[in-house]
Interface confidence: low
């Protein structure tokens, strides 16, 4: 589109895609598809131990000097910035001897308006500004370079795009007299995708887009576009994949109506489609064309946004997600919980499952938290015996090519794995809980009654006596 | 030149009181949250109290908790603490520090402060 | 509140060699990629100096001498080559939750 064109940094095309890259030449290396884990199953930490000593003796150097940081650069097309007008930029650790690219996008929930954006960047600048913005990061989880503690992409190239536009990575507005904030997520992600094409991502087989809360919505957004730009930049050999990790939100209606006046208190549909206007932000084209003029506000939300997507995208989900809850007025304090409110965590878990249903690549477990892929225990957690990290690779394989034209899951590789079990922290690997007002560590048991369920009801759908229950809880916390 | 100044310090007999004063400049001091620590003598460094850059959020260690209080003067470019019910263990250099935006940690420290508890 | 233990308490190190301070917190201090630790030197007389912030980044004016490294619980400082001027103490400290602490010190130095 005509809009998208005008912010191509002038006199600096990307280079053309080297030929050779898409067809490597005899003696080439070709990167190898991820491993395969079934047959280990069984001994997965004899079997990682072994993998990072072998990767350790194939680096030139010594494991000790192998720098786990990502390095900051800023970007050369000055003009993308940050809501302060200082550069948006991104973390970058090459690996390269790989064709794959993750690139994450940072959440921190948004602002909407000038009191509530005066107000983040008072308190929070570093999610609207680069000017302190440290050299190096660390990358955890999914962006970890260790195959222990990410066995899923740890050879990737890894970026790791803060997040500093407070407009869900949906904007493409400038600083100007009138605006006293840019609001350009949306334009920094492409800005980021032109820059990486000069340091070998031009040479890349995938990119997988991801992010965690406001940055995993931020990929249901911008999943497409960023496909849309490498086919128009000449490069439609790479494929485009998206990973959004809690950014799944739901329309639904609050548990206690509040007015909205800031970031947290206010519904979820009154912050977005104020939002929206304040940030000029723009969305998938193919959903836009769904809703009317005004109504775009409905593709901030993946239920609605999923089904008009081109590129695969695998959702990651707690059933229970603290910022859904913080946003439906639902704040559990160290107070016990009322029936009423009981019944609708319960019921918003139901409803996140339902949404899910369609959603053939997903991870959903029932537990009450927020965020995981960069988290460094990611790993930890199980929805019906598999791993994230495991799905997620069952998942690269049912979109390998021999797996193209069938739609059948791949044998003992599941992809689609949501808890079906209804009430918070059912699933033994939830991460802990703690209580909101304390900042203490609960057991189930202790959290569950906390949250008022009764032990009995809890109990009989597991065929078990309440003190079964209690024991198994205990130990599985 | 982006400086901190302390002053105030004095001798004080046990359950006196005593307030000392930090002036800010080379900055924008209203953009930035303050802290007090403190170093006995011979001994290592301990958190006092925080103010946010708004002072909407005010944090004492616990030791201190109720027998001083942070308050700050953004107009006038300066940092305060009223110490009150004074013990011998409050003998130390106190010094002011600006906390960094982002990272928590103290990126401009005054020269100090000597309070002295002593009967 | 963390409770951060620094090691050793003092250490002696020949000029132009390595100088290792570690320091170890009774919870993680990372969230998010982020590792909340600093480092500062405090010479007789003075304020401490910010040196390393966020574990492993060199504050501007600092000398690349000076390195950090770490996350989670454990943190490194290494100082390497070791000059004179290095002789003094070093500290620790954690931003990631009220109270930020501070580690016990240590005292390096040079023969």
């Known amino acids: 589109s005509e809009g998208r064109k005008t912010w191509r940094r002038r006199g600096q095309q990307p280079p053309p895609p080297p030929r050779t890259e898409a067809a490597p030449a005899a003696g080439q290396p070709v990167e190898s598809f991820p491993l395969d884990f079934t047959a280990v199953e069984g001994n997965m930490d004899s079997f990682m131990a072994q993998v990072k000593s072998l990767a350790q003796s194939l680096y030139p150097c010594s494991a000790q000097q192998l720098n786990e940081d990502l390095r900051l650069h800023l970007l050369l097309n000055t003009s993308v910035t940050c809501n302060d007008g200082s550069p948006a930029g991104y973390y970058l650790k090459e690996s390269r001897g790989s064709r794959r690219w993750l690139l994450f996008l940072e959440g921190g929930w948004y602002c909407f308006n000038r009191e509530n954006c005066d107000s983040r960047y008072d308190t929070m600048r570093r999610l609207m500004s680069s000017r302190d913005w440290p050299r190096t990061r660390t990358g955890t989880g999914i962006l970890s370079s260790q195959p222990e503690e990410n066995p899923y992409w740890w050879n990737a190239n890894m970026v790791f795009i803060p997040y500093c536009s407070s407009d869900v990575w949906s904007g493409a507005s400038p600083k100007s007299d009138k605006n006293e904030y840019a609001f350009m997520g949306s334009l920094i992600i492409q800005e980021v995708v032109r820059e990486l094409l000069g340091k070998g991502l031009s040479g890349a087989k995938v990119l997988l887009l991801a992010g965690s809360s406001a940055g995993g919505t931020g990929v249901l957004l911008n999943v497409d576009r960023v496909a849309e730009l490498l086919e128009e930049l000449g490069y439609p050999s790479i494929q485009v994949r998206g990973l959004a990790d809690s950014g799944w939100f739901l329309d639904n209606k609050q548990y206690r109506r509040s007015d909205c006046i800031d970031t947290i208190n206010c519904a979820p549909t009154d912050a977005i489609r104020r939002g929206i206007r304040y940030w000029s932000g723009m969305v998938p084209e193919r959903c836009q064309r769904q809703f009317k003029e005004g109504e775009e506000w409905n593709c901030f939300f993946g239920y609605k946004v999923y089904p008009t997507l081109r590129c695969p995208v695998f959702v990651v989900q707690w059933l229970f997600d603290e910022a859904q809850l913080t946003v439906d007025n639902v704040h559990l304090t160290g107070q016990p919980v009322q029936e009423g409110l009981r019944l609708y965590i319960q019921n918003l878990g139901r409803e996140l499952r339902h949404t899910l249903k369609d959603v053939p690549a997903s991870f959903a477990p029932a537990c009450l938290s927020h965020e995981i892929i960069i988290r460094s225990h990611w790993t930890d957690v199980q929805v019906k015996g598999t791993s994230l990290p495991r799905a997620l690779h069952c998942w690269d394989r049912s979109l390998h090519d021999s797996h193209k034209a069938s739609k059948t899951p791949l044998k003992g590789c599941p992809v689609h794995l949501v808890d079906s079990c209804p009430w918070p922290h059912c699933n033994p690997s939830c991460p802990t809980v703690r209580d909101q007002f304390t900042g203490q560590e609960m057991n189930v048991a202790q959290f569950l009654m906390h949250m008022g369920f009764d032990m009995q009801t809890v109990a009989q759908p597991q065929g078990l006596e309440p003190s079964e229950l209690l024991g198994m809880l205990s130990n599985g916390s | 030149e982006v400086q901190l100044v302390e002053s105030g310090g004095d001798l004080v007999k046990p359950g006196g009181s005593l307030k000392l004063s930090c002036a800010a400049s080379?900055?924008?001091?209203?953009?930035?949250?303050m802290h007090w620590l403190r170093q006995a003598p011979e001994k290592g460094l301990e958190w006092v109290a925080y103010i946010s850059s708004g002072s909407t959020t005010l944090s004492y260690a616990n030791t201190m908790k109720g027998r001083f209080t942070i308050s700050r003067d953004n107009a006038k470019k300066t940092l305060s603490l009223q110490m009150t019910s004074l013990r011998s263990e409050d003998t130390a250099i106190y010094y002011c520090?600006?906390?960094?935006?982002?990272?928590?940690?103290?990126?401009?420290w005054g020269t100090g402060t000597t309070v002295t508890v002593s009967s | 509140d963390i409770v951060l233990t620094q090691s050793p308490a003092s250490l002696v190190v020949s000029l132009g060699q390595r100088a290792t301070i570690s320091c170890r917190a009774s919870?993680?201090?990372?969230?998010?990629?982020?590792?909340?630790m600093h480092w500062y030197q405090q010479k007789p007389g003075q304020p401490p100096k910010l040196l390393i912030y966020l574990a492993s980044n060199l504050e501007s004016g600092v000398p690349a001498r000076f390195s950090g490294s770490g996350s989670g619980t454990d943190f490194t400082l290494n100082i390497h080559p070791v000059e004179e001027g290095d002789a003094t103490t070093y500290y620790c400290?954690?931003?990631?939750?009220?109270?930020?602490?501070f580690g016990s010190g240590t005292k390096l130095e040079i023969k």
């Open positions: 080379g900055f924008t001091f209203s953009d930035y949250g």
């Open positions: 520090a600006r906390k960094n935006y982002n990272g928590g940690y103290f990126d401009v």
């Open positions: 400290q954690h931003s990631r939750v009220l109270p930020p602490t």
């Open positions: 919870k993680s201090v990372s969230e998010s990629g982020y590792s909340y």
